[in-house]
Interface confidence: low
């Protein structure tokens, strides 16, 4: 009779993580008598996956009833596959012996490859805010995918970016892989509403890529422009001076009025108006009682925005003649009155 052969008909099997792998194995003869064992890997360090004779293998089920005397199908199923299960599996026939069974013949092996989905990409921006015209870096990371082939793209508001560098680790063979990419983005004043998107495509995603996003509102700082104007006279001896703070982001802003260099009042931006581009405008105003003054007054509007060094704008208030109409009445009625008598 022809000598027993162990046939593993599948050179390779590709399974999605979490799925079940079927590893097929048939013998060509019932002789010699003895059990089958399945191993991952070959040589002395091989790992026992299933032993027909003894042991507990909760993730493994046999395809056929191995207790039947005429059974020659030793295929197994391994449940809940993870990338760590990847490797070459050998079906090995043992000959019954005393005291131990003796390895008789091995199948050619079946390579189990595991397809694992990448994790959702995580995009992170710089630790500190930057102003328009500056270049900032964003990183994107995704982990745990297999096989190694993966595609990563960057977009800003739907437009693909080209200035980025990507690495897939490790370089050699591994059960799963990670991708890390850094993109450079130039900020503009209009970027408060902008988004940076990292898009990852992988064979396991079936054409539906994963995306990670970062809002540039977390990254950008748009410094304000200031304008101090003298408004029309409200009463014979009162002048209304306004400080218009325009086009700033984020909202965190503190304004200080100085009269001839001395601090008059400090306030925090509260009732701001939002522009279409996401930046803010705010206005503060003073009612100055000019009759209490003999000399000209230098009024300074000083603004500290988002913890940055203060910027200021001054206005010289002439008290020798009656105040003339200067500037315009823009939005003055919409803000609270900050009345101040100067003595």
């Amino acid at each position: 009779e022809e000598e027993l052969q162990v046939i593993q008909p599948d050179k390779s099997v590709l399974v999605a993580a979490g799925e079940t792998a079927t590893l097929r194995c048939t013998a060509t003869s019932l002789i010699p008598v003895g059990p089958i064992q399945w191993f991952r890997g070959a040589g002395p360090g091989r790992e026992l996956i299933y032993n027909q004779k003894e042991g507990h293998f909760p993730r493994v089920t046999t395809v056929s009833d191995l207790t039947k005397r005429n059974n020659m199908d030793f295929s197994i199923r391994i449940g809940n596959i993870t990338p760590a299960d990847a490797g070459t599996y050998y079906c090995v026939k043992f000959r019954k012996g005393s005291p131990d069974d003796v390895e008789f013949k091995s199948g050619a092996g079946t390579e189990l490859s595991v397809r694992a989905k990448p994790s959702a990409p995580v995009v992170s921006g710089p630790a500190a805010r930057a102003t328009p015209q500056h270049t900032v870096s964003f990183t994107c990371e995704s982990h745990g995918f297999s096989p190694r082939d993966i595609t990563l793209k960057w977009f800003k508001n739907g437009n693909e970016l080209s200035d980025f560098q990507t690495n897939v680790d490790p370089v050699g063979e591994s059960v799963s892989y990670s991708i890390h990419s850094t993109a450079k983005v130039v900020l503009t004043r209009e970027d408060v509403h902008s988004q940076v998107i990292c898009e990852v495509a992988h064979v396991t995603l079936q054409g539906d890529p994963l995306r990670g996003t970062a809002n540039l509102s977390e990254t950008i700082r748009v410094p304000p422009t200031l304008e101090v104007t003298q408004q029309p006279v409200r009463a014979e001896n009162q002048v209304n001076v306004t400080c218009q703070v325009r086009k700033f982001y984020p909202q965190r802003l503190q304004l200080t009025w100085l009269e001839n260099g001395n601090v008059s009042r400090t306030e925090t931006a509260s009732t701001v108006t939002e522009n279409k581009d996401g930046t803010y405008n705010w206005m503060s105003w003073l009612l100055v009682n000019v009759s209490a003054h003999r000399d000209d007054v230098k009024l300074t509007c000083q603004v500290e925005h988002d913890g940055q060094p203060a910027v200021s704008k001054s206005h010289d208030l002439k008290v020798s003649a009656h105040p003339k109409e200067q500037g315009s009445n823009t939005a003055a009625e919409n803000t609270g009155s900050n009345e101040r008598n100067i003595y």
Partner: antibody, heavy 123, light 107 residues
Framework: QIQLVQSGPELKKPGETVKISCKAS????????MSWVKQAPGKGLKWMVW????????TYADDFKGRFAFSLETSASTSYLQINNLKNEDTATYFC????????????????WGQGTLVTVSA | DIVMTQSQKFMSTTIGDRVSITCEAS??????VAWYQQKPGQSPKLLIY???NRYTGVPDRFTGSGSGTDFTLTISNMQSEDLANYFC?????????FGSGTKLEVK
Amino acid sequence: QIQLVQSGPELKKPGETVKISCKASGYTFTTYGMSWVKQAPGKGLKWMVWINTYSGVPTYADDFKGRFAFSLETSASTSYLQINNLKNEDTATYFCARDPHYYGSSPAWFVYWGQGTLVTVSA
Amino acid sequence: DIVMTQSQKFMSTTIGDRVSITCEASQIVGIAVAWYQQKPGQSPKLLIYSASNRYTGVPDRFTGSGSGTDFTLTISNMQSEDLANYFCQQYSAYPFTFGSGTKLEVK
């Protein structure tokens, strides 16, 4: 296209034997595993067996060992289910269902189903 | 054997509703779960495989989710043609087992 066509309804008496068939077409029969599924009237689905069409070896659910015999006629691309010593509780619709992939890649959900064969066991 | 429990035998719905059908496995099955729809007198029809993959031609109002032991089939915008029986199935280990089914009825 892929089709599984089952034999017609059967009316049997308790103690008799029934053999129903499932003929496959539109693919290579021995490349895909085949299962049989039972559905009693108004009840759920019970998986009975998976047959390795390559080796002919069946894998049974415990409830279907003994009186149930499953066989193949590969030249005719046909799978058979035979129930011996019929009992009233065997009254059900029996479906054959094919694996979705070449079974080296292992999943076992069912895309392709036969239309079902109603077996009625009544004295 | 792995027991697949569909705790709700019947669910009353309204057309346009969002419906979630749950299935619990008695032990970890990874993502080796499929969902089927069956109408009276018909064979089951595959909707979802690998827990969350929609089968070709299945409307995108059907979505599957879950892994491990807890699985959900969601119909986002219930249609009259969705009134049927729904079964989950595990194929992680032999014997393959089905849930007992959840029948969707109109209120």
